[in-house]
C-alpha cells in the first residue's frame, strides 16, 4: 500500500530536492494539531498565534479575547487555566522540568471580572502542581510535597497534609516510579465532580533504595542527584489514599480509603482513581505480581464521615496468560446510573474489547468483538458511546473513531471517521465537549495532519481547525520517501512492517537497509501516521531503505502476540526482527552486506541483542540509552513482564537476557553505544556495564556520552546525536559524505 505516492510530473523533477539533515534538526517540516480547551458544550478556549486567550462559541461563530497577550507577557506566562466559574485564570510561568510529566512553576491568578491580578495571599513558589476545582474557583496545590486548599484565590490557604518531605513522603504528586510507570501524570490528586471532596495519594519512599548520579553542571564540584528508584525486586513505595471534605476541611480531616483485603495481603500498587459522583469513588489496585487487579467502588457514609468499600462492589480482573491489562490496566467509564460502567479488557478469544459491567465481571456484556482491538473509550453519553479501534480494513496500525448507540436496542455501530478523508487520514484521536455536543477530530496521518470540528449529533464537519497549509506548501518541492505498510506471515505469526523507500526506488537495484526498532511490550511502531524525521531523511537523501517491524510482544493484535514475551523479555522481540530481515533480503532489493539496526531505550536493548545474535546479518548498529539488564530497570515496569529476580521466580532469565552476557558476539559488528549521563529513567549504569563487559572481552566498539542529559537527549544534544549517528551509518554503508 503506497501511502505517499511521489509526484509524477517529470517537469517538476528538477525543482524538487531531497530532505536534508538540517531540515530535520530545524523542525522545518513539523506539523500542528488543534485541541480545543472545552469550557462548555459549545464553547472552547484557544491560545492564538499572537498569544491572546480567545473564547470561541461554535453556535454563534463568534469569538472574543478574554485574556490579552499583554497580560500573559507581564508575567512571562507560557500556560493558563480558566476557573470553571470563569472568574479567574491561573497563569503559569518559570516552567522547570523535572521528570517525564512533572515540572514546577510559578503561578499567578488573574481576576477577569476586575481585570487585575489577585493580590494578597499569593501562591508560594515554586509549585509542584496546581488545579482548579471542577466547579467554582477553589484551588488545590502541592508545595514542598504537601497539599494546600484555597476556597477562593484570594483566601489564605488551608494546609491539608503536613508530613511531606523531599524524596521521602509525597502527597498529591507521584514519586518517580509511580509517575513514570503507573499513573503517567504529574499529579496524584482528584477532585470529586462538584468539588465537594478531594482525593489524594500519599507515597512513602522512606525504604526505597536511591539511585545516585553526578550532575556536572559548571561548578567546581559536581552535584549528586538522588532519586528513590525501586529497581526490579527492590523495596517499593507504600501508597495510601485519602479523601478530604473541601467544604469543611478541618472538621474530620483526611479519611483513608481502605484497601481490598485480597490486595492488602501482599505488596501492591494503587493504579488509578475515578470519581463517579460526589459521594462515590472508584479505586483500582494491583498486586505487585501484576496479573491480578481489583476495582473497588466506595461510598461516603455521612453518619461516620468515612468511606466504605463493600466486598460486593469489588471487581477482580485477572490474566492467566500474561499481566493484567495492556500497558496499563484500563480505567472504567461510568454510565449515568453511577454504578455500571464500560471497560476494556480481554475477551475469551484474547482480544481487548469493551465490556459493560452492571453487577459482576463474570456477567459482563461484551459490547465490541472481533479479531481486532478496542483501544480507548472517549465518552459515554445517555445514548452514545464513542471509542477508537483498529478494526477498519484489518490494519492494526490505524485508529478510527466509532459511535455505538447505547440508547437503542439492539445497539448500532457507526464508524465516524473511516471514510472522511480516507487516503489522508487513517489514524485519529478525538476531544469531546460537555455531553458530546461537539467534538474535534485530530488526524495524524498518513497524510498531512488535519484537525476538524464536528457536530456531536450528526457527525457533520463544521470547520477545519488546523490543516497545516504552510507545511503542505513547504513539502511541494521535497522528494519525500515512499512508505508502505504490509505484513509477513511467518510460522503462524503476523509481522506487520512499515517500509520507507527512497523517492526513486527501483526494485531491481540493491539498497542498504536500516531497521529501526523499539519492540517493547504493548508498543506499536507500525502506525499509519505522518512523520518527516531522521529516517525520512536517510531514505530521501542517503538512499537507504528503512523498516520498522512489530513482532511478538507488541500491541493491539490480540493477547497471543502481546503476552508471547511474558517472563521472557529479549528473546522473541529479537527473533522477530531477524526473521523480518531475512524476509526483506528475499524481496531482492536489499544489499545484504549493508544491513544495520538501531533503537532507543527498549529499542537500544533489542538492537544490542540483535547485533549480538551471532547471525551475521547485521554489519553495524546503534543503541541509544539501552537497558542492558532487567535488574537495573524500574520494578513496576520490569516485574509486570518479567516477574521477580529471585531464585524461586525468574532470576535465571533475568541473568540470561542481559546484553553483557553476549559481549563476545559484538566482535564481528560495528557497535555505537550512546547514553546521557543524567538519565533518570534508564540509568547510565546500563551502558557503563555494557562498555565494561566489551572492554573485558577485548571487543572494540564506539561510544558517545552526553553530559548532564536525560533519557530524551534534548536540545543541542539532539543535533549532535543525529549528526553523529548519520556519520556512523554512512561510514558503515560506505556512503560518501
Amino acid at each position: 500500500i503506497v501511502l505517499r505516492p511521489s509526484r509524477v510530473h517529470n517537469s517538476e523533477e528538477n525543482t524538487m530536492r531531497a530532505l536534508t539533515l538540517k531540515d530535520i534538526l530545524n523542525g522545518t517540516f513539523s506539523y500542528k494539531t488543534f485541541f480545543p480547551n472545552w469550557i462548555s458544550g459549545q464553547e472552547y478556549l484557544h491560545q492564538s498565534a499572537d498569544n491572546n486567550i480567545v473564547l470561541y462559541n461554535i453556535e454563534t461563530g463568534q469569538s472574543y479575547t478574554i485574556l490579552s497577550n499583554r497580560t500573559m507577557k507581564s508575567v512571562n506566562a507560557s500556560n493558563y487555566g480558566l476557573s470553571p466559574d470563569r472568574q479567574f485564570v491561573y497563569l503559569e510561568s518559570d516552567y522547570s522540568k523535572l521528570w517525564r510529566y512533572s515540572y514546577t512553576a510559578t503561578y499567578y491568578i488573574y481576576d477577569l471580572s476586575n481585570g487585575e491580578f489577585v493580590r494578597g495571599n499569593e501562591l508560594p513558589r515554586p509549585i509542584q502542581y496546581l488545579c482548579w476545582s471542577p466547579v467554582g474557583s477553589k484551588l488545590a496545590y502541592v508545595y514542598q510535597n504537601n497539599i494546600y486548599l484555597k476556597q477562593r484565590p484570594g483566601d489564605p490557604p488551608f494546609q491539608i497534609t503536613f508530613n511531606g518531605r523531599e524524596n521521602k513522603i509525597f502527597n498529591g504528586i507521584p514519586d518517580w516510579v509511580y509517575e513514570e510507570e503507573m499513573l503517567a501524570t504529574k499529579y496524584a490528586l482528584w477532585w470529586s465532580p462538584n468539588g465537594k471532596f478531594l482525593a489524594y495519594a500519599e507515597f512513602n519512599d522512606t525504604d526505597i533504595p536511591v539511585i545516585a548520579y553526578s550532575y556536572y553542571g559548571d561548578e567546581q564540584y559536581p552535584r549528586t542527584i538522588n532519586i528513590p528508584y525501586p529497581k526490579a525486586g527492590a523495596k517499593n513505595p507504600v501508597v495510601r489514599i485519602f479523601i478530604i471534605d473541601t467544604t469543611y476541611p478541618a472538621y474530620v480531616g483526611p479519611q483513608e480509603v481502605p484497601v481490598p483485603a485480597m490486595i492488602a495481603s501482599s505488596d501492591y500498587y494503587f493504579s488509578w482513581l475515578t470519581w463517579v459522583t460526589d459521594e462515590r469513588v472508584c479505586l483500582q489496585w494491583l498486586k505487585r505480581v501484576q496479573n491480578v487487579s481489583v476495582l473497588s467502588i466506595c461510598d461516603f457514609r455521612e453518619d461516620w464521615q468515612t468511606w466504605d468499600c463493600p466486598k460486593t462492589q469489588e471487581h477482580i480482573e485477572e490474566s492467566r496468560t500474561g499481566w493484567a491489562g495492556g500497558f496499563f490496566v484500563s480505567t472504567p467509564v461510568f454510565s449515568y446510573d453511577a454504578i455500571s460502567y464500560y471497560k476494556i479488557f480481554s475477551d475469551k478469544d484474547g482480544y481487548k474489547h469493551i465490556h459493560y459491567i452492571k453487577d459482576t465481571v463474570e456477567n459482563a456484556i461484551q459490547i465490541t468483538s472481533g479479531k481486532w482491538e478496542a483501544i480507548n473509550i472517549f465518552r459515554v453519553t445517555q445514548d452514545s458511546l464513542f471509542y477508537s479501534s483498529n478494526e477498519f480494513e484489518e490494519y492494526p496500525g490505524r485508529r478510527n473513531i466509532y459511535r455505538i448507540s447505547i440508547g437503542s436496542y439492539p445497539p448500532s455501530k457507526k464508524c465516524v471517521t473511516c471514510h472522511l478523508r480516507k487516503e489522508r487520514c487513517q489514524y485519529y484521536t478525538a476531544s469531546f465537549s460537555d455531553y458530546a455536543k461537539y467534538y474535534a477530530l485530530v488526524c495524524y496521518g498518513p497524510g498531512i495532519p488535519i484537525s476538524t470540528l464536528h457536530d456531536g449529533r450528526t457527525d457533520q464537519e463544521i470547520k477545519i481547525l488546523e490543516e497545516n497549509k504552510e507545511l503542505e506548501n513547504a513539502l511541494k518541492n521535497i522528494q519525500l520517501p515512499k512508505e508502505e505498510i504490509k505484513k509477513l506471515e511467518v510460522d503462524e505469526i503476523t509481522l506487520w512492517y512499515k517500509m520507507i523507500l527512497p523517492p526513486q526506488f527501483d526494485r531491481s537495484k540493491k539498497y542498504p537497509l536500516l531497521i529501526q526498532v523499539y519492540g517493547g511490550p504493548c508498543s506499536q511502531s507500525v502506525r499509519s501516521v505522518f512523520a518527516v524525521n531522521w529516517i525520512s531523511y536517510l531514505a530521501s537523501k542517503e538512499g537507504m531503505v528503512i523498516a520498522l517491524v512489530d513482532g511478538r510482544g507488541t500491541a493491539f493484535q490480540g493477547d497471543k502476540l502481546l503476552y508471547a514475551v511474558y517472563r521472557k523479555l529479549g528473546v522473541y522481540e529479537v527473533e522477530d526482527q531477524i526473521t523480518a530481515v531475512r524476509k526483506f533480503i528475499e524481496m531482492g532489493f536489499i544489499d545484504e552486506k549493508r544491513i544495520a539496526i538501531w533503537g532507543w531505550s527498549y529499542g537500544g536493548y533489542v538492537s544490542s541483542l540483535a547485533l549480538a545474535s551471532g547471525t551475521g546479518l547485521f554489519k553495524c548498529g546503534i543503541a541509544v540509552a539501552p537497558v542492558s539488564s532487567w535488574e537495573y530497570y524500574a520494578s513496576v515496569y520490569t516485574e509486570r513482564f518479567m516477574g521477580l529476580p529471585t531464585k524461586d521466580d525468574n532470576l535465571e532469565h533475568y541473568k540470561n537476557s542481559t546484553v553483557m552476557a553476549r559481549a563476545e558476539y559484538f566482535r564481528n559488528v560495528d557497535y555505537l553505544l550512546i547514553h546521557g549521563t543524567a538519565d533518570d529513567n534508564v540509568h547510565f549504569q546500563n551502558s557503563a556495564q555494557i562498555a565494561k563487559a566489551l572492554v573485558n572481552a577485548q571487543v572494540d566498539f564506539q561510544a558517545m556520552w552526553y553530559s548532564d542529559q536525560n533519557h530524551g537527549l534534548s536540545g543541542l544534544s539532539t543535533n549532535h546525536l543525529y549528526t553523529h549517528m548519520t556519520h556512523f551509518l554512512k561510514q558503515c554503508f560506505s556512503l560518501s559524505d
Epitope: 458544550g41 471580572s113 455536543k437
Partner: nanobody
Framework: QVQLQESGGGLVQTGGSLRLSCAAS????????MGWYRQALGNQRELVAG???????YYPDSVKGRFTISRDNDKNTIYLQMNSLKPEDTAVYYC???????????WGQGTQVTVSS
C-alpha cells in the same frame, strides 16, 4: 458599540425579593454565555450567576438556592431573580459576558441593590 442596560434594583428588607433585568444589544447577546456580577463598596467585582446559551447555569455557594438566572433570547434579556435577600447582598449589580471580554468598555452603569436589616 455594545450596550448593556441593567434595571430592577432598589431598597428591600432582609428576606425580601427583587428581579433584575439586563437588556443587551443582539450581536453580543445571541448565543453567548452571560453573567450577573456585583460590586459592594470597597470590594472587588464578583460573579453571582452565569448562564450559557443552552441554559446551563452556575451559582457560587454564597447565593445558591436563593438566586436564579434566566434568559429570554427573543428579547435579548437576562434576568436575576433574587430571593431571601441578606444585607451582604448589598452591591451594585452588573450584567456582562461570562467571562467578560477584555477591553470591553461597556460595563453598564449597573443597578444598585440595598438590603436593609
Amino acid at each position: 458599540q455594545v450596550q448593556l442596560q441593567e434595571s430592577g434594583g432598589g431598597l428591600v428588607q432582609t428576606g425580601g425579593s427583587l428581579r433584575l433585568s439586563c437588556a443587551a444589544s443582539g450581536s453580543i447577546f445571541v448565543g453567548n454565555a452571560m453573567g450577573w456580577y456585583r460590586q459592594a463598596l470597597g470590594n472587588q467585582r464578583e460573579l453571582v450567576a452565569g448562564i450559557t446559551s443552552d441554559g446551563t447555569t452556575y451559582y457560587p455557594d454564597s447565593v445558591k438556592g436563593r438566586f436564579t438566572i434566566s434568559r429570554d433570547n427573543d428579547k435579548n434579556t437576562i434576568y436575576l431573580q433574587m430571593n431571601s435577600l441578606k444585607p451582604e447582598d448589598t452591591a451594585v449589580y452588573y450584567c456582562n459576558l461570562w467571562p467578560p471580554r477584555i477591553g470591553f468598555a461597556s460595563w453598564g452603569q449597573g443597578t444598585q441593590v440595598t438590603v436593609s436589616s
